[in-house]
């Protein structure tokens, strides 16, 4: 029959060429002379001329070696025609299958593969995957089936086989325990890919395994003991820099130190921070230290890392002996602000109080005193005893210097240290009121009509405090009572002045004597303008002119 089975031709055939493959034959050749031809890619279309046919015999010819990796299968058509060119058979399909030879080595997709794995992991942990390709056939043959293996490992520490590779997938895994970044930060593996499922051609590449840091090393103090000297009272003073070493990766959370004062800081006097570059612990004073109270502090500082330890590790502790240095401290007034009650107007030379300071220093230093600020110049202070005496009249009613009955004075104490130091204190004199002011009417000028006059109400003020104020009493003197009356209201804080007889238009002096509850008397002259008018007036009208 006019059919042909698929033809298998191995690639890379060595000839000789042309090579006979198969014979096309039509049974119509009994009747007539038959001429054979082939068409299709590989015959009369690109790649042309790979195959040919002997026109009269029908032998299918291969003209050159085949390459399966270029073309794995050719599909041609066979034709049979008579002498006159008429087709005697339908075109016949000819399949030529190129069979594989192992003519390609595996190729790794990269020359160098890079992967990483955390130090200290267990065997079985995957690290990375490598890949090699092989152009040969891996479906019907083993020519293109790649098997992976590890040829060598550098360094060979702690074991010469720290890793293994899945022969089919190329996945590299940890096989041995003991990956330690601090000893071996990187491994270089020479990996092999071998075709024929491990029995053929081999190619190599490099796999670099970076060992990643885990916090498996504790920071250690070096040294562990420190001695420091700090002046007393200094706040924010750098006491000591503590140094640690940590084998983990620098500037990582596994390396960065965290410091904690574990003991010896009962008064919460110290604080410790981490220097961002050096990783040192910077111990500073949070509060001032007091030499007189405690001249030595022994601190215990523990160091850990920002990152938690991945396993149980012993923590390092440092001991810091802090010697507090004595400083000449300023005298301190006791109390810093002293309130003293004193009567206003006490005689000059009269003692007001004693106001002294204490020196925190243990030596018996001499303290001298002086007044630093005495706005009214009312006081003096004994430089030795701190005795404050009056040298001027203390006036409670002096609004320039006294606020809310209090006169404020600043005093200074100075020790005889080298150099001397000073301290200040505030003396708050609460001035006790004395009845030294009489009542005063307001206003002191009035305008009143001489016909049907309106009563004039005057407010009474007294600079003193109760009980040296209302109720007040009023009395007219110097014959003012002939024309005027003066009466204090029921509350006793105003006086009503009335014109009781006709006075011609003019200005008059009304002599009004007011006394307070303590009988302090004050005479005031009221200037009264009497106008020719009726009832209420504020200013006298001008003279009337008729028309």
């Amino acid at each position: 029959d006019w059919v042909v089975a698929p033809i298998s031709v191995p690639e890379n055939g060595k000839g000789p060429f042309p090579q006979r493959l198969n014979q096309l034959k039509s049974n119509k050749d009994r009747d007539t002379k038959i001429f054979y031809s082939i068409t299709g890619p590989g015959a009369d279309s690109p790649p042309e001329g790979v195959f040919a046919v002997e026109k009269e015999t029908g032998w299918l010819l291969l003209n050159k070696p085949l390459d399966r990796e270029e073309i794995a299968k050719y599909e041609l058509f066979g034709h049979a025609v008579s002498e006159n060119g008429a087709s005697v058979e339908d075109p016949m399909n000819i399949s030529i299958i190129v069979t594989d030879q192992n003519d390609h080595k595996p190729k790794f997709t990269q020359d160098t593969f890079r992967g990483s794995v955390l130090e200290g992991v267990l065997p079985g942990t995957s690290v990375m995957q490598v890949t090699a390709t092989d152009e040969d056939d891996a479906i019907y043959t083993y020519n293109g089936v790649v098997a992976y293996s590890i040829h060598s490992q550098e360094p060979k520490d702690p074991h010469d086989l720290m890793f293994t590779i899945h022969r089919s997938t190329g996945t590299i895994s940890v096989i041995s325990s003991g990956l330690d970044r601090e000893k071996v930060p990187e491994y270089t593996l020479t990996i092999q890919a071998t075709d024929m499922d491990g029995d053929g051609s081999t190619t190599t590449a490099v796999a670099v395994v970076e060992i990643l840091d885990a916090n498996d090393n504790a920071p250690m103090f070096d040294p562990q003991k420190y001695e420091a000297h700090v002046p007393e009272n200094a706040v924010g003073h750098e006491v000591q820099r503590l140094t640690v070493t940590d084998l983990d990766a620098p500037n990582s959370p596994a390396w960065r130190a965290t410091y904690l004062i574990m003991g010896g800081d009962d008064g919460d006097h110290f604080t410790i921070t981490t220097h961002p570059e050096s990783n040192q612990g910077i111990l500073t004073t949070r509060k001032g230290l007091d030499f007189e109270a405690k001249n030595q502090h022994t601190l215990y500082v523990e160091v850990t890392n920002e990152a938690p330890f991945v396993l149980k590790l012993p923590t390092s502790t440092a001991t810091i002996v802090v010697h507090v240095e004595d400083v000449n401290e300023a005298p301190v007034f006791v109390p810093p602000s002293k309130v003293v009650e004193v009567q206003e107007g006490i005689p000059t030379g009269e003692p007001v109080c004693v106001y002294t300071a204490e020196d925190p220093d243990k030596e018996n230093q001499k303290i001298s005193y002086r007044i630093l600020r005495d706005p009214a110049g009312w006081l003096a202070m004994d430089p030795d005893s701190g005795q404050v005496t009056a040298v001027g009249t203390l006036d409670r009613e002096d609004e320039q210097f006294v606020r809310n009955n209090i006169y404020e004075v600043m005093v200074l104490a100075m020790d005889n240290g080298s150099p001397p130091t000073t301290g200040t204190g505030t003396l708050l004199l609460t001035l006790i009121d004395v009845n030294d002011h009489g009542p005063v009417p307001e206003p002191r000028q009035i305008t009143i009509c001489n016909q049907s006059p309106v009563r004039q109400v005057l407010n009474i003020t007294d600079k003193d405090l109760s009980p040296h104020t209302s109720p007040f009493q009023a009395q007219l003197t110097d014959d003012s009572d002939i024309y005027w009356t003066a009466e204090v209201n029921e509350e006793g804080d105003t006086v009503v002045l009335s014109l009781k007889k006709f006075l011609k238009q003019d200005t008059y002096d009304v002599h009004l004597s007011l006394s307070d509850h303590g009988n302090k008397e004050q005479l005031t002259v009221i200037r009264a303008t009497v106008c020719d008018c009726h009832g209420h007036v504020e200013t006298c009208p001008g003279p009337w002119k008729g028309g």
Epitope: G120, P123, G124, I175, G178, V310
Partner: antibody
Framework: EVQLLESGGGLVQPGGSLRLSCAAS????????MSWVRQAPGKGLEWVSA????????YYADSVKGRFTISRDNSKNTLYLQMNSLRAEDTAVYYC??????????WGQGTMVTVSS | QSALTQPASVSGSPGQSITISCTGT?????????VSWYQQHPGKAPKLILS???KRPSGVSNRFSGSKSGNTASLSISGLQAEDEADYYC???????????FGGGTKLTVL
């Protein structure tokens, strides 16, 4: 001589706890991953748990996950297995073994754990 | 159900040779050359007799040998002796957190 010696086995009620120890000698203990492998009476070997040389990494079989805790103290050359919420099916001889890099060697002599009411 | 499959039992007469198979998958036995074999006498702890498919630790008789083909590993014992009667377990490395697999064990009887 390389040696592993287990202790701590015994009879315990279901739901109870037990702590096994394995003392190592004759080799650099901290350089090796260690495992616990158990064998129920008349049955085969079953891997239970593993811990890395540093102690920073651990594995557990699904059957014991959440109930057993493996740990080690390299300063004492000792491996531990804390077993909580014990069940009847945990009854077995428990062996500690050192991972040699693809195989277990050596093995301890084993300690018997019986979970029964 | 064990991860690796072994015959439950094999037997042989003294002087004979026997082979115990251990079948896994392409992700364990087939993937790595880390098949090991352990011998366990009754009441005793397992003892390593072969590592890395065919490597004998010192002190192990050369009558024990190992091989691997595809996903199946084999333990061969030649010149069978009475003291070889024991249980034999194969084991294979596999990646992941179930990093080691055991076979169900094979009871060897020396007739």
């Amino acid at each position: 001589e390389v040696q592993l010696l287990e202790s701590g086995g015994g009879l315990v009620q279901p739901g109870g706890s037990l702590r096994l120890s394995c003392a190592a000698s004759g080799f650099t203990f901290s350089s090796y991953a260690m495992s616990w492998v158990r064998q129920a009476p008349g049955k085969g070997l079953e891997w239970v748990s593993a811990i890395s040389g540093s102690g920073g990494s651990t594995y557990y079989a699904d059957s014991v996950k959440g109930r057993f805790t493996i740990s080690r103290d390299n300063s004492k050359n000792t491996l531990y297995l804390q077993m909580n919420s014990l069940r009847a099916e945990d009854t077995a001889v428990y062996y500690c073994a050192s991972w040699g890099g693809g195989w277990f060697d050596p093995w301890g002599q084993g300690t018997m754990v019986t979970v029964s009411s | 159900q064990s991860a690796l499959t072994q015959p439950a039992s094999v037997s042989g007469s003294p002087g004979q040779s026997i082979t115990i198979s251990c079948t896994g998958t392409s992700n364990d036995v087939g993937a790595y050359n880390y098949v090991s074999w352990y011998q366990q006498h009754p009441g005793k702890a397992p003892k390593l007799i072969l590592s890395e498919v065919n490597k004998r630790p010192s002190g192990v008789s050369n009558r024990f040998s190992g091989s691997k083909s595809g996903n199946t590993a084999s333990l061969s014992i030649s010149g069978l002796q009475a003291e070889d009667e024991a249980d034999y377990y194969c084991s294979s490395f596999t990646s992941g957190d179930h990093w080691v697999l055991f076979g169900g064990g094979t009871k060897l009887t020396v007739l």
